[in-house]
């Protein structure tokens, strides 16, 4: 692969459908602008979950309607995905691009298998 990207192999979402994991990349140089994308792979189909571009030293900013939030510290990005349900169980791949200054470097993680278990409905109380 090109740039090395590390992420945990498995994460279990909370009962509220929230999953967090760290995506860490080994930067060849001193990038000032970084783009992080979370991709979901299921049945050989890859879809984009969310993406954010940030300047080193600044916070990640996802779109307002994004299901992702995150913080960055050096070459490490802490990602949180919300609103997950059992059907969202799958492999979540972290893609990191060093956008500026040139040259462009790309790295793809091996993916984090996120397991989501829908909570049991509360029993009716008499």
């Amino acid at each position: 692969k090109a740039m090395h990207v590390a992420q945990p192999a498995v994460v279990l979402a909370s009962s509220r459908g929230i999953a967090s994991f760290v995506c860490e990349y080994a930067s060849p140089g001193k990038a000032t602008e970084v783009r992080v994308t979370v991709l979901r792979q299921a049945d050989s189909q890859v879809t984009e979950v969310c993406a954010a571009t940030y300047m080193m030293g600044n916070e990640l900013t996802f779109l307002d309607d994004s299901i992702c939030t995150g913080t960055s510290s050096g070459n490490q990005v802490n990602l949180t995905i919300q609103g997950l349900r059992a059907m969202d169980t799958g492999l979540y791949i972290c893609k990191v691009e060093l956008m500026y200054p040139p040259p462009y470097y790309l790295g793809i993680g091996n993916g984090t298998q996120i397991y989501v278990i829908d909570p049991e409905p509360c029993p009716d109380s008499d």
């Epitope: 060849p28 140089g29 890859v46 791949i93 040259p103 790309l106």
Partner: antibody
């Protein structure tokens, strides 16, 4: 201004050796992965070799067509990258470019392998 | 290894035409694709990096699109100075293979 200047090309006999050099300036050389790419007469671009930098332990990668015959190296103190070419074949004839991870390119140096 | 299938191999179009060149990869390269322009006697010039991003100093006539295994370079309005050979390249992983090239001429 970014500059990559290749040298060392010329006429070489089949089976012979040649060493290409590429001197870089205008950017932080040690932050970059360096590559050699060639273009044979009437052919397309062919990636040959890559050397990564210190954070990547100077890992090297080669195309199948040159693996075992060509060696890429670098000297960060001299802002230079090299391509040692051994057991040259007539099909190695072409213009050789050095490039800083494909963003910046040199002007190229012509290597002709012929008897 | 990732195989790059570029088409067409040559193309003739008129000034002002919209021109598209495609590149298909043998497996998903996650947008790790660059496009280059090479004019005779000149070094290759990076046009598009990461499938969609315009390189510094490149005319906005050029744009890139695509994901997965299918990618496109578009010239919105062909100009005489665009006569060149265009190449795609996989930059996801070694070997960093190039497409076979598209030679673009003016009618």
């Amino acid at each position: 201004e970014v500059q990559l200047v290749e040298s060392g090309g010329g006429l070489v006999q089949p089976g012979g050796s040649s060493r290409l050099s590429c001197a870089a300036s205008g950017f932080t050389f040690s932050d970059n992965w360096m590559n050699w790419v060639r273009q044979a007469p009437g052919k397309g671009l062919e990636w040959l070799a890559q050397i990564r930098n210190k954070p990547y332990n100077y890992e090297t990668y080669y195309s199948a067509s040159v693996k075992g015959r060509f060696t890429i190296s670098r000297d960060d103190s001299k802002n230079s990258v090299y391509l040692q070419m051994n057991s040259l074949k007539t099909e190695d004839t072409g213009v050789y470019y050095c490039t800083a991870q494909f963003a910046y390119w040199g002007q190229g140096t012509l290597v002709t392998v012929s008897s | 290894d990732i195989q790059m299938t570029q088409s067409p191999s040559s193309l003739s179009a008129s000034v002002g035409d919209r021109v598209t060149i495609t590149c298909r990869t043998s497996e998903n390269i996650y947008g790790g694709l660059n496009w280059y322009q090479r004019k005779p006697g000149k070094s290759p010039k990076l046009l598009i990096y990461g499938a969609t991003n315009l390189a510094s100093g490149v005319s906005s006539r050029f744009s890139g699109s695509g994901s997965g295994t299918d990618y496109t370079l578009t010239i919105s309005s062909l100009q005489p100075e665009d006569v060149a050979t265009y190449y795609c390249q996989n930059v996801l992983r070694s070997p960093f293979t190039f497409g076979s090239g598209t030679k673009l001429e003016i009618k």
